[in-house]
Amino acid sequence: QRLPRMQEDSPLGGGSSGEDDPLGEEDLPSEEDSPREEDPPGEEDLPGEEDLPGEEDLPEVKPKSEEEGSLKLEDLPTVEAPGDPQEPQNNAHRDKEGDDQSHWRYGGDPPWPRVSPACAGRFQSPVDIRPQLAAFCPALRPLELLGFQLPPLPELRLRNNGHSVQLTLPPGLEMALGPGREYRALQLHLHWGAAGRPGSEHTVEGHRFPAEIHVVHLSTAFARVDEALGRPGGLAVLAAFLEEGPEENSAYEQLLSRLEEIAEEGSETQVPGLDISALLPSDFSRYFQYEGSLTTPPCAQGVIWTVFNQTVMLSAKQLHTLSDTLWGPGDSRLQLNFRATQPLNGRVIEASFPAGVDSSPRAAEPVQLNSCLAAGD
C-alpha cells in the first residue's frame, strides 16, 4: 500500500505534543559483560529501558543490583505537554504532583518549552511530508535489519506507560541506515487516535493516518541513550503508518490481543518474542528521511527519522482495539496520543525514491524542487 496523495488537507484529529516512552536504554550490556554464574539474568531481566519520559528522551540511568546481572533504566521524570489550541484537548493526562513538573501529557499545561527548552527547537518532529518537495537521494539504500525475528523466549515486556503501549526489545536487533550508520533497536511503541479520528504523528500532504508505529534505535557509536541525546544521528526512529485493510494482521494481533491485560496505566505483561520486522512494511527501499527530534519531552534533536512510503494494513477491528482498550491516568482513555506537526524551518526531507513523480494529481509535471544533500555519498 503506497501512501495516498491527498489533494486537500484532511482534518487532523488529535493531541498536541509528545512522543511516547521509548528510550532510555541506559547501559546496554556490552559483549564482554559476563553475567555471574550464580544467578544470571532471568527471562524477565531484559536489558533495556524502563518507562521513559519521551520517545526520544533520556533518563538518567541506574544499573540494577548486581545479582540480576542485567541493567534496566529507572523511571525517569517526565514533563507535561502543552495543549494544541487548534486541537481538542486530550483527556489522557497526568495529574500534577505538587510543583514537581515531572509528568507530561498530551494537551495540557505547562507548555513543553518551559520544562524542556529543546521542545522549542527549530528542528522538531513530527512533520508533514510533502513528497513533491522531497529531494530524491539515490544514495539512500534499502534499510538493513538483522536479528529482528525474535524467538518466543525470552518473553518481552509489553507496557502501558500512560501515554502509549511500548514493547521493550532485547539487545541484538541491528539496523543499518547505510554503510557506517549502524543502530541497535531499543523499543517500539504506537501512536493512535480515537473512534473516527486518525492519530498518526507524521502526516502526508496534511493527511493523518489512523496510527503510526515507531521503532526507536540507538547508534552503535554510543553505549547509552543519554550520551546520544541531542547528538546528530545518535538516535534513529523507523516510522510506519498503519491503515485500515480488509484482513487481520497476524503480526500485530500478537500484541493487540494482549492489550486488555494492560488496560490500566502502568500495567505490563510478558509476551512471546515475535518477528519485529513483520510489524513494518515489507518494502525497505522506499522511504523518506529527515533529521528531527523526539516527539515528547525532552524533545532532543538530532534524531534521524525514516518514514516508510509503504503502509501497514490492520483490520478495522484491530485499529479499534488499539484506540479503545487502554486507559491513561485517572479515568481517562489513552487516545489521541500524538504531537502536532512541527515546522520544517528550512529542512529538506529526502526520499530514497523519486517521490515527486506521480506523487500528486495536482502536478502535471513532476517537480523536484530540492536537491539531495547526500548526493556525494
Epitope: E38, S70, G147, P151, P170
Partner: antibody, heavy 121, light 112 residues
C-alpha cells in the same frame, strides 16, 4: 548453590506414560524460562520443550507435540515433563535446563544431572 | 541431520590450538541469532561454555573463545589440555522451524 535435581526416569512400555520432575534451588525459579533437552544414546542434543517463567507460555518440538506436556509449580520450585504415548524413539537421557537470559538470548546455563528414560517392550 | 553442521571430530596435541566450526544458514545464524557453545565431558551433563557468540561465563578459562561471522560460528581452544577431551555442541535459533531451538550435531574433541 544453584542446582537442578531431576527424578522420575525409568523403563516404560511403548504407549505408556512417565512424568519427570526437576527441583530447582539457589535462584529465583519464577524469573527463569526452563527447558527440557534430551540426548538419545550415542547421539547429540535435541531440544524438547520450554516454558516461560510464569508458566503462561509453552513450546514444543514437533516430535513430541501433542504427547508431552511441560508445566511448572513456582510455589514448589519444580519443573515437570508429562510424557504420554511414549515411543521407542523417545528413549534418551532427559535433562532439565535453566534458560539464562544473556543479552536477550536464552542460553542453557544450568543443567540437571539427567535422567534416563527407556521405552521398550 | 542437524540444522547446524559441525565436524564429527577434531583432534590436537596438548598445547595446540584447535577450532570447531558450526555452519548454519540465513534462517538461523545468518539471521542474527546468537550462538552458544556447550561442553559435555564423558558421562556428565552439558555445561555452558560460551554464550552470545563470544562471552565466557565465570569459571570458564580464557583458553576458550567464540566468534561468529555470516552464517557460521566457531569455537577456538588454545593451549589444549587433556581435560578438554569432550563433546562440544553449538546452539542457536531458527526462524523457519517450529522447534526454534537448534543444536549442532556435536563434535568429539580428542586430545592426542
Amino acid at each position: 548453590q544453584v542446582q537442578l535435581v531431576q527424578s522420575g526416569g525409568g523403563l516404560v512400555q511403548p504407549g505408556g506414560s512417565l512424568r519427570l520432575s526437576c527441583a530447582a534451588s539457589g535462584f529465583t525459579f519464577s524469573s527463569y524460562a526452563m527447558s527440557w533437552v534430551r540426548q538419545a544414546p550415542g547421539k547429540g542434543l535435541e531440544w524438547v520443550s520450554a516454558i516461560s517463567g510464569s508458566g503462561g507460555s509453552t513450546y514444543y518440538a514437533d516430535s513430541v507435540k501433542g504427547r508431552f506436556t511441560i508445566s511448572r509449580d513456582n510455589s514448589k520450585n519444580t519443573l515437570y515433563l508429562q510424557m504420554n504415548s511414549l515411543r521407542a524413539e523417545d528413549t534418551a537421557v532427559y535433562y532439565c535446563a535453566r534458560n539464562g537470559n544473556y543479552r536477550g538470548s536464552l542460553a542453557f546455563d544450568i543443567w540437571g544431572q539427567g535422567t534416563l528414560v527407556t521405552v521398550s517392550s | 541431520q542437524s540444522v547446524l553442521t559441525q565436524p564429527p571430530s577434531v583432534s590436537g596435541a596438548p598445547g595446540q590450538r584447535v577450532t570447531i566450526s558450526c555452519t548454519g544458514s540465513s534462517s538461523n545464524i545468518g539471521a542474527g541469532y546468537d550462538v552458544h557453545w556447550y561442553q559435555q565431558l564423558p558421562g556428565t551433563a552439558p555445561k555452558l561454555l560460551i554464550y552470545g557468540n563470544n562471552n565466557r561465563p565465570s569459571g570458564v578459562p580464557d583458553r576458550f573463545s567464540g566468534s561468529k561471522s555470516g552464517t557460521s560460528a566457531s569455537l577456538a581452544i588454545t593451549g589444549l589440555q587433556a581435560e578438554d577431551e569432550a563433546d562440544y555442541y553449538c546452539q542457536s535459533y531458527d526462524s523457519s522451524l517450529s522447534a526454534w531451538v537448534v543444536f549442532g550435531g556435536g563434535t568429539k574433541l580428542t586430545v592426542l
